[in-house]
C-alpha cells in the first residue's frame, strides 16, 4: 500500500549555475527500512519495462560509499527517515524534476522535487512595510530563495550606493518547510530619505557582486517649509510693507492647506503662500511662521521675528 510513504521537503528549490543545492527531506516508509535509493533527473515511467527511465544522478547501491568529496550528488540520508540531498556544484541542465526512487523490501515509491537552476544568480527581493513614516523605525527585509551549506553568500544593504551603517541581521532556513536567506535591517528614515534608492546586494563569500534588488523609498512626512522675508533682516519702520513667502521644499503626500501664524495664533484669511503686510504698525511686531498640512499632519516653518520700529 503506497499510501504508507510520507515525505516532507520544499516543493521547489532554486539555485544558479555553479552554486549548490541542499534539499532538506524526511520520509517514512511504515513497512521497514529502505533497501535502496536512486535519484533520477526527469524520470519517466516505462510501461514496457515497468521501470523508470532517466538520468541516474545517484544510486545508493553504487555511490553510498564513494568519498563525499568526489561526488557531485550526495545522498545525506539514511534508511528510515532522512532523505536529504546535496548537489554541488549544480548546473543549468539540472533544472527540472528530481525523482527520488525509494525501495523497501515490499514497496516502491517515486517522490518528485522540482529544481529551478538559473543561468545567473537571481536577485533577492526587498520587502517594505506598507507605509513608511519619517522617524518611525521600520524593518526592511531582503529575501532570497536560496541557501546551501556549500556555498556561503551575504546580503548587503546600500542607500544611494553607499553601505548602510545600521546593523543587519541575517538568518538562513534550510528546513523541510523552507529554504531561504533573509536579511533584516531596522531603520528610522528621515524625510530626506524620501525618493532615495535602497539596494539589497547579493554577494558571494568574498564580497563579489552576484545580483541585487532595488526599491525607491516612499517616506511619508509632514510638509517641510522654508520662509523668506523681505526685507531679509525683518526690521522695518512703521508704515513700511513686509512680504513673507512660504516655500514647500518637500511634502509626501501632497499638501492640502496653508496658514500663517503670529505668535502661535492663526492669522485669519491668510491661506496663500505669500503674506503681504502693508503699512505695518508697531503692534504687528512678533514671531511669524507658515504652517502647511498634509494627510500626515502639519508642518511649520522656522519663525521669523518681525521688528517694527517707530518711524
Amino acid at each position: 500500500d503506497s499510501s504508507k510513504w510520507v515525505f516532507e521537503h520544499p516543493e521547489t528549490l532554486y539555485a544558479w549555475e555553479g552554486a549548490c543545492v541542499w534539499i532538506p527531506c524526511t520520509y517514512r516508509a511504515l513497512d521497514g527500512d529502505l533497501e535502496s535509493f536512486i535519484l533520477f533527473h526527469n524520470p519517466e515511467y516505462n510501461k514496457n519495462t515497468s521501470k523508470f527511465d532517466g538520468t541516474r544522478l545517484y544510486e545508493s547501491t553504487k555511490d553510498g560509499k564513494v568519498p563525499s568529496e568526489q561526488k557531485r550528488v550526495q545522498f545525506l540520508g539514511d534508511k528510515n527517515k532522512n532523505c536529504t540531498l546535496s548537489i554541488h556544484p549544480v548546473h543549468l541542465n539540472d533544472s527540472g524534476q528530481l525523482g527520488l526512487r525509494m525501495e523497501s523490501k515490499t514497496e516502491k515509491w517515486m517522490e518528485r522535487i522540482h529544481l529551478n537552476v538559473s543561468e545567473r544568480p537571481f536577485p533577492p527581493h526587498i520587502q517594505l512595510p506598507p507605509e513608511i513614516q519619517e522617524s518611525q523605525e521600520v524593518t526592511l527585509t531582503c529575501l532570497l530563495n536560496f541557501s546551501c551549506y556549500g556555498y556561503p553568500i551575504q546580503l548587503q544593504w546600500l542607500l544611494e550606493g553607499v553601505p548602510m551603517r545600521q546593523a543587519a541581521v541575517t538568518s538562513t532556513s534550510l528546513t523541510i518547510k523552507s529554504v531561504f536567506t533573509r536579511s533584516e535591517l531596522k531603520f528610522s528614515p528621515q524625510w530626506s530619505h524620501h525618493g532615495k534608492i535602497v539596494t539589497c546586494q547579493l554577494q558571494d563569500a568574498d564580497g563579489k557582486f552576484l545580483s541585487n534588488d532595488t526599491v525607491q523609498l516612499n517616506v511619508k512626512h509632514t510638509p517641510k517649509l522654508e520662509i523668506k522675508v523681505t526685507p531679509s533682516d525683518a526690521i522695518v519702520r512703521e508704515g513700511d510693507s513686509v512680504t513673507m513667502t512660504c516655500e514647500v521644499s518637500s511634502s509626501n503626500p501632497e499638501y492640502t492647506t496653508v496658514s500663517w501664524l503670529k505668535d502661535g495664533t492663526s492669522l485669519k484669511k491668510q491661506n496663500t503662500f505669500t503674506l503681504n503686510l502693508r503699512e505695518v504698525t508697531k503692534d504687528q511686531s512678533g514671531k511669524y511662521c507658515c504652517q502647511v498640512s498634509n494627510d500626515v499632519g502639519p508642518g511649520r516653518s522656522e519663525e521669523v521675528f518681525l521688528q517694527v520700529q517707530y518711524a
Partner: antibody, heavy 120, light 112 residues
C-alpha cells in the same frame, strides 16, 4: 538465495593471459559492486578492485592496475576478471565477493574461489 | 596504502575459552561519511570467507552473539566469548573505508 558461481581452475603459461568468471544469481546483479580478492598461501589476502555492473564503473588497487581488467555482462549476470602477462606471483586463489548493502557495505556473499596456477 | 596489522598470528585456545584478536590500522579508517568500515571475516580450510562483523561492532545476520567487535580510530578488537569447535579457522580484519581496501595478515585460531 544469493550465490556466486566461479569458473574452474586454470593452468596457464607465464606471459599468457587468463579470464575468470563469476556468475551471480538470486539478486539484481547490476545493482551491487562486485569485488575481486587475491589469496596466496602464506601471503594473506589482497583486494584487487571492484566493478559496478550497472554502468561498468571500476576502482582498482594501484598494485593491480595494468594487471587485472574487470568487466561485467549484465545479460548473463556474470562478472569477469582478466589477468595479463602472468608470472609465478600471479599463482593464487581468486575470489569474487559482492558488496551487499546500500548502507552498511560489506562482502556478504563470496564465490568459492578460482585457482590460477602459472607454470611452464 | 593503509596497513592492517593483526595480532597474534596464531591463537591456540581451549574450547570454552575467551579469545581476543587485535587489528591495528596504520591510519584512521573513518570514512568521509562518518562511518568506519571495519569488518571481520572467518575463513575455514577449503572454504570461502564468511562475514562475522561489519562497521566495527555490528554482527552479521546469523552470527552467534558470542562474537563481538569493538574499537575506534585505529585500534580494533574481535572477541569470542566461548570458543566452539566451529569457530576454528583464520580470522581476517578488513578496512573498506579508503582505496585500496586492505586486509590484515590473518590470525589462526586453533586448538591448544
Amino acid at each position: 538465495q544469493v550465490q556466486l558461481q566461479q569458473s574452474g581452475p586454470e593452468l596457464v603459461k607465464p606471459g599468457a593471459s587468463v579470464k575468470i568468471s563469476c556468475k551471480a544469481s538470486g539478486y539484481e546483479f547490476s545493482r551491487s559492486w562486485m569485488n575481486w580478492v587475491k589469496q596466496r598461501p602464506g601471503q594473506g589476502r589482497e583486494w584487487i578492485g571492484r566493478i559496478y555492473p550497472g554502468d561498468g564503473d571500476t576502482n582498482y588497487s594501484g598494485k593491480f592496475k595494468g594487471k587485472a581488467t574487470l568487466t561485467a555482462d549484465k545479460s548473463s549476470s556474470t562478472a569477469y576478471m582478466q589477468l595479463s602477462s602472468l608470472t609465478s606471483v600471479d599463482s593464487a586463489v581468486y575470489f569474487c565477493a559482492r558488496d551487499g548493502s546500500s548502507w552498511d557495505w560489506y562482502f556478504d556473499v563470496w564465490g568459492a574461489g578460482t585457482t590460477v596456477t602459472v607454470s611452464s | 596504502d593503509i596497513l592492517m596489522t593483526q595480532t597474534p598470528l596464531s591463537l591456540p585456545v581451549s574450547l570454552g575459552d575467551q579469545a581476543s584478536i587485535s587489528c591495528r590500522s596504520s591510519q584512521s579508517i573513518v570514512h568521509s561519511n562518518g562511518n568506519t568500515f571495519l569488518e571481520w571475516y572467518l575463513q575455514k580450510p577449503g572454504q570461502s570467507p564468511k562475514l562475522l562483523i561489519y562497521k566495527v561492532s555490528n554482527r552479521f545476520s546469523g552470527v552467534p552473539d558470542r562474537f563481538s567487535g569493538s574499537g575506534s580510530g585505529t585500534d580494533f578488537t574481535l572477541k569470542i566469548s566461548r570458543v566452539e569447535a566451529e569457530d576454528l579457522g583464520v580470522y581476517y580484519c578488513f578496512q573498506g573505508s579508503q582505496f585500496p581496501y586492505t586486509f590484515g595478515g590473518g590470525t589462526k585460531v586453533e586448538i591448544k
